[in-house]
């Protein structure tokens, strides 16, 4: 038994990092592998993650992280049973990749505005609380050329557009993600998308 | 919102002990370190020692190596800094403070006074 | 004793910008990161900088930090009267065995 692709993980700056991995064939992750990780510091403990399939040959591993900071570093040993297939370490705030904002809701009824809200994934005592900005994709569900990003740079988590910039009449969809500078972090998976019908009063030609 | 309540102030003779306690609240208790801090009075802090609230190992300054003993209850959320064979340098605020590689919370502080 | 060394005391007037520096070596600063804490008169330190340079939540981006090589640099802009405390920097000594080491203290002075 061999590792064919080694693991490499993300982390959401929170509670949990991800990693992936291939082995050289079909295998049962959960009850040929274990996966070690223990943070280098003072005290620390080693942890045990048992790993799911990902896949014929690929694993996955969710390893839960309490209190990550920029000075964390882990290492981490695949073990098969009594044998070492792989020694490695991982710094999560090099590693980023936020969670998924939710909550996102399209209110229709502010003045021919359409106003878009989501809720910030991460506590106000989490650093990338006040350092994530957002893109919004809005797509219509009947012309697949109507799809179009709006880049969210300020921290509120909003955006604010007229809604005779889409087309009156038919249905929307909307999903958001989010990124963080600070740690060039990879941008989060979208957030499910909400779904609204646009309609608005088209101005009166004199 | 996280809480570090530390017990009242303390006057002891030279060479007796002292255990200060640290309840916490807020928080997970388990999940994050927590450390013992001094000051005597006018000086500036010294770092005494991390207790590991999860498993309870603990690491001290070598200046206290021998003398001071840190402990934790799970079930109460407490945390406990013992330090014996009290000298009259050892008068000081001790405070408790949560924390990995820096102190986020602090106690409010105990103030212990050896005296004879 | 400290290996962190801070200038005793700084002092400015209101609405001016002072940083208090903090000097160590290759096994702590040079090797480590750096927290920085204000402690107002009475009471108990507060984290006021970790990670080098990153602000805890709900405090002011008047405060900001620095490091470079083994020092580090706390920034304080737009001086009020209640920033009137003793800051002391720290930081992980990675000597055998490893353990947090603090500043002298630096008491600042609003004029």
């Known amino acids: 038994m061999k590792v064919l692709q080694e693991p490499t993980c993300v982390s959401d700056y929170m509670s949990i990092s991800t990693c992936e991995w291939k082995m050289n064939g079909p295998t049962n992750c959960s009850t040929e592998l274990r996966l070690l990780y223990q943070l280098v510091f003072l005290l620390s403990e080693a942890h045990t993650c048992i790993p799911e399939n990902n896949g014929g040959a690929g694993c996955v591993c969710h390893l839960l992280m309490d209190d990550v900071v920029s000075a964390d570093n882990y290492t981490l040993d695949l073990w098969a049973g009594q044998q070492l297939l792989w020694k490695g370490s991982f710094k999560p705030s090099e590693h980023v990749k936020p969670r998924a904002p939710g909550n996102l809701t399209v209110h229709t009824n502010v003045s021919d505005t359409l106003l878009l809200t989501w809720s910030n994934p991460y506590p106000p005592d989490n650093y990338l609380y006040n350092h994530l900005t957002y893109a919004v994709n809005i797509w219509s569900e009947n012309d697949p050329a109507d799809f179009r990003i709006y880049n969210v740079t300020y921290l509120e988590p909003s955006l604010r557009i007229a809604a005779s910039t889409l087309k009156s009449g038919i249905s929307y969809r909307a999903r958001v993600r989010a990124w963080a500078q600070c740690y060039n972090t990879t941008w989060s998976e979208w957030s499910p998308s909400t779904k609204w019908h646009n309609s608005y009063r088209e101005p009166f030609e004199q | 919102q996280v809480q570090l309540v530390q017990s009242g102030a303390e006057v002891k003779k030279p060479g007796a002990s002292v255990k200060v306690s640290c309840k916490a609240s807020g928080y997970a208790f388990t999940s994050y370190y927590m450390h013992w801090a001094r000051q005597a009075p006018g000086q500036g802090l010294e770092w005494m020692g991390i207790?590991?609230?999860?498993?309870?190992?603990?690491s001290y300054a070598q200046k206290f190596q021998g003398r001071v003993t840190m402990t934790r209850d799970t079930s109460t959320s407490t945390v406990y800094m013992e330090l014996s064979s009290l000298r009259s340098e050892d008068t000081a605020v001790y405070y408790c403070a949560r924390g990995k590689w820096w102190l986020y919370n602090w106690g409010k502080g105990t103030l212990v006074t050896v005296s004879s | 004793q400290s290996v962190l060394t801070q200038p005793p005391s700084v002092s400015a007037a209101p609405g001016q910008k002072v940083t208090i520096s903090c000097s160590g070596g290759?096994?702590?600063?040079?090797?480590?990161?750096v927290s920085w804490y204000q402690q107002l008169p009475g009471t108990a330190p507060k984290l006021l900088i970790y990670?080098?340079?990153k602000r805890p939540s709900g405090i002011p981006d008047r405060f900001s930090g620095s490091k470079s090589g083994t020092s580090a640099t706390l920034a304080i802009t737009g001086l009020q009267t209640g920033d009137e405390a003793d800051y002391y920097c720290g930081t992980w000594d990675t000597s055998s065995p490893p353990q947090p080491i603090f500043g002298t203290g630096t008491k600042l002075t609003v004029l």
């Open positions: 290759s096994s702590n600063i040079g090797n480590s990161y």
């Open positions: 990670d080098n340079n």
């Open positions: 207790i590991n609230p999860s498993g309870g190992s603990t």
